[in-house]
């Protein structure tokens, strides 16, 4: 018969033949062949394979580092990474959970809507029109533009979300 | 290194004061907003004070408002928690922090007890 050019679903090709993939928190020892199906071996303690799989070597599960506030939130399996989480009181610098802050701060542009609490982080928003942030903050709000007509000046540089307007003295030429 | 040592901590009686510091180093301290937090025996952070890298503008807790006053000094690499009319619940580890508010930045904190 023809060798096959593509396999069934868990399956791989290999040396023109259809092998059987290692299920999830399975490595592979060997390929299948013509007489022998696929050898697989379970992952050791602290690894992990969490899908079906030729890999030879497991995944070490992510260490939750307390030196960066980490703790585990659910310990991994043979087929389930660690899940880390931050100390009570901290939040998550991202969505992988690799470190912990005490509150993230808002970036130039945008102004603080709600200060960070122990089981909320930092909200922020953008500064609207006429108004500003030049600064990274965790508790400033967005500042309104300055107004030049109530100290008797002319704008002579427009406002953005990240910079006060430039007053300057008004034109003496006009009548 | 970033390094925030606090100190100024002790044993108060209600309505007394006392002023913590928090002596940073290890990078450039003038214009990074910094924060005062505390932790009460066997509760969770919270937020104190904070004060923009300018100096120019403060947060207070609703708790120590009209109570605490924060503080820079840049040429002295210092940060200050002024404490007056202190109570029983201002109890607590205080900690200073600096942005970007990282936990290995996270300083020993300073104890301080208010009881008569």
């Known amino acids: 018969p023809e060798p096959p050019t593509a396999c069934r679903e868990k399956q791989y090709l290999i040396n023109s033949q259809c092998c059987s993939l290692c299920q999830p928190g399975q490595k592979l020892v060997s390929d299948c062949t013509e007489f022998t199906e696929t050898e697989c071996l379970p992952c050791g303690e602290s690894e992990f394979l969490d899908t079906w799989n030729r890999e030879t070597h497991c995944h070490q599960h992510k260490y939750c580092d307390p030196n960066l506030g980490l703790r585990v939130q659910q310990k991994g399996t043979s087929e389930t990474d660690t899940i880390c989480t931050c100390e009570e009181g901290w939040h998550c610098t991202s969505e992988a959970c690799e470190s912990c802050v005490l509150h993230r701060s808002c970036s130039p542009g945008f102004g603080v809507k709600q200060i960070a609490t122990g089981v909320s982080d930092t909200i922020c928003e953008p500064c609207p029109v006429g108004f500003f942030s030049n600064v990274s903050s965790a508790f400033e709000k967005c500042h309104p533009w300055t107004s030049c007509e109530t100290k008797d000046l002319v704008v002579q540089q427009a406002g953005t979300n990240k910079t006060d307007v430039v007053c300057g003295p008004q034109d003496r030429l006009r009548a | 290194e970033v390094q925030l040592l606090e100190s100024g901590g002790g044993l108060v009686q209600p309505g007394g004061s006392l002023r913590l510091s928090c002596a940073a180093s290890?990078?450039?301290?003038?214009?990074?907003e910094m924060w005062w937090v505390r932790q009460a025996p066997g509760k969770g952070l919270e937020r104190v004070s904070?004060?923009?890298?300018?100096?120019?503008?403060?947060y207070y807790a609703d708790s120590v408002k009209g109570r605490f006053t924060i503080s820079r000094d840049d040429s002295k690499n210092t940060l200050y928690l002024q404490m007056n009319s202190l109570r029983a619940e201002d109890t607590a580890v205080y900690y200073c922090?600096?942005?970007?508010?990282?936990?290995?930045?996270w300083g020993q904190g300073t104890l301080v007890t208010v009881s008569s």
């Open positions: 904070a004060i923009s890298g300018s100096g120019g503008s403060t």
């Open positions: 922090a600096k942005e970007p508010y990282s936990y290995d930045y």
């Open positions: 290890g990078f450039t301290f003038a214009g990074y």
